[in-house]
């Protein structure tokens, strides 16, 4: 068990802060909830603190919750591939470029680390080149979320990881908006981290609303499990 992994044996409170600017539309989001890495479970509620969110909530899910991949459930035989927990408590920097097909792109920079007993995901997001009447600024996405696989590989040069995946957002007319994600994670501290073999995270997310919440918001339930590395030969012969 890495030193960081010991911090995730129980339920951990999560705080998310985002400052965003998409095509000049500025906004802020605050999120709170908890994570339980034993089950790979996240429960979070996000509120736009600046009024109405200028982009559809589903386009921010990867920035919020795929941001705290330290809550992914890594099975016993894969624990030596869990970069995310091994970087704790000092944390990691997570940078992404998200290309929305036939539309603009988001660039995000985030810091994920412990502050006291709370795991904090602090993010800034800049979006450019979006069409005012496109699927994103035109709010044409359905309020739901598909399951995805998130592919992880080691980046030995930077003592971190590189991550690639493609999100499929459902559009109201029945078509799909693709969002290509290119991600890089580097540790903040200079302690040792686990550099993984290639594997993937399997994610399932459910979006809902709080009937008592008047402000623009999103409620998120998510389960994430690591997969893609089989037991070693010694395991087979036990």
């Amino acid at each position: 068990m890495s030193k960081g992994e010991e911090l995730f044996t129980g339920v951990v409170p999560i705080l998310v802060e985002l400052d965003g600017d998409v095509n000049g539309h500025k906004f802020s989001v605050s999120g709170e909830g908890e994570g339980d890495a034993t089950y790979g479970k996240l429960t979070l509620k996000f509120i736009c603190t600046t009024g109405k969110l200028p982009v559809p909530w589903p386009t921010l899910v990867t920035t919020f919750s795929y941001g705290v991949q330290c809550f992914s459930r890594y099975p016993d035989h894969m624990k030596q591939h869990d970069f995310f927990k091994s970087a704790m408590p000092e944390g990691y920097v997570q940078e992404r470029t998200i290309f929305f097909k036939d539309d603009g792109n988001y660039k995000t920079r985030a810091e994920v680390k412990f502050e006291g007993d709370t795991l904090v995901n602090r993010i800034e997001l800049k979006g450019i080149d979006f069409k005012e009447d496109g699927n994103i600024l035109g709010h044409k996405l359905e309020y739901n979320y598909n399951s995805h696989n998130v592919y992880i590989m080691a980046d030995k040069q930077k003592n971190g990881i590189k991550v690639n995946f493609k999100i499929r957002h459902n559009i109201e007319d029945g078509s799909v908006q693709l969002a290509d994600h290119y991600q890089q994670n580097t540790p903040i501290g200079d302690g040792p981290v686990l550099l993984p073999d290639n594997h993937y995270l399997s994610t399932q997310s459910a979006l809902s609303k709080d009937p008592n919440e008047k402000r623009d918001h999103m409620v998120l339930l998510e389960f994430v499990t690591a997969a893609g590395i089989t037991h070693g030969m010694d395991e087979l012969y036990k």
Epitope: G91, R109, E124, I188
Partner: nanobody, 122 residues
Framework: QVQLVESGGGLVQAGGSLRLSCVAS????????MGWFRQTPGREREAVAA????????YYSDSVKDRFTISIDNTRNTGYLQMNSLKPEDTAVYYC????????????????WGQGTQVTVS
């Protein structure tokens, strides 16, 4: 308690240079980032440049790229902002700031601030 003391501001002609210094004290700054923001009356603070203490990662705003250089001297706990080819629009109060972790361009994410030093380009 972290203390930040800036110096090096002043009046300079367009095209000239200045070097701002920021001495940080009150703790060890390994794992920290340092940034320089600037502010003109009636406007919010804008990020100019930032650097991690290890100098692995830096940021420059588009308006100062190729003119300003940020650096850190770990042995002296001091950060510098070398400003070349100064323009009248660089006139502002320049603030040094530090935070634990990485840099951001969002001012509210930074925790400790200096008093600021005035830079005037005529």
């Amino acid at each position: 308690q972290v203390q930040l003391v800036e110096s090096g501001g002043g009046l300079v002609q367009a095209g000239g240079s200045l070097r701002l210094s920021c001495v940080a004290s009150g703790r060890t700054f390994s794992g920290y980032a340092m940034g320089w923001f600037r502010q003109t009356p009636g406007r919010e603070r804008e990020a100019v440049a930032a650097i991690t203490w290890s100098a692995h990662s830096t940021y420059y705003s588009d308006s100062v790229k190729d003119r300003f250089t940020i650096s850190i001297d770990n042995t002296r706990n001091t950060g510098y902002l070398q400003m070349n080819s100064l323009k009248p629009e660089d006139t502002a109060v320049y603030y040094c700031t530090v935070r634990h972790g990485t840099w951001f361009t969002t001012s509210r994410y930074w925790t400790d601030w200096g008093q600021g030093t005035q830079v005037t380009v005529s």
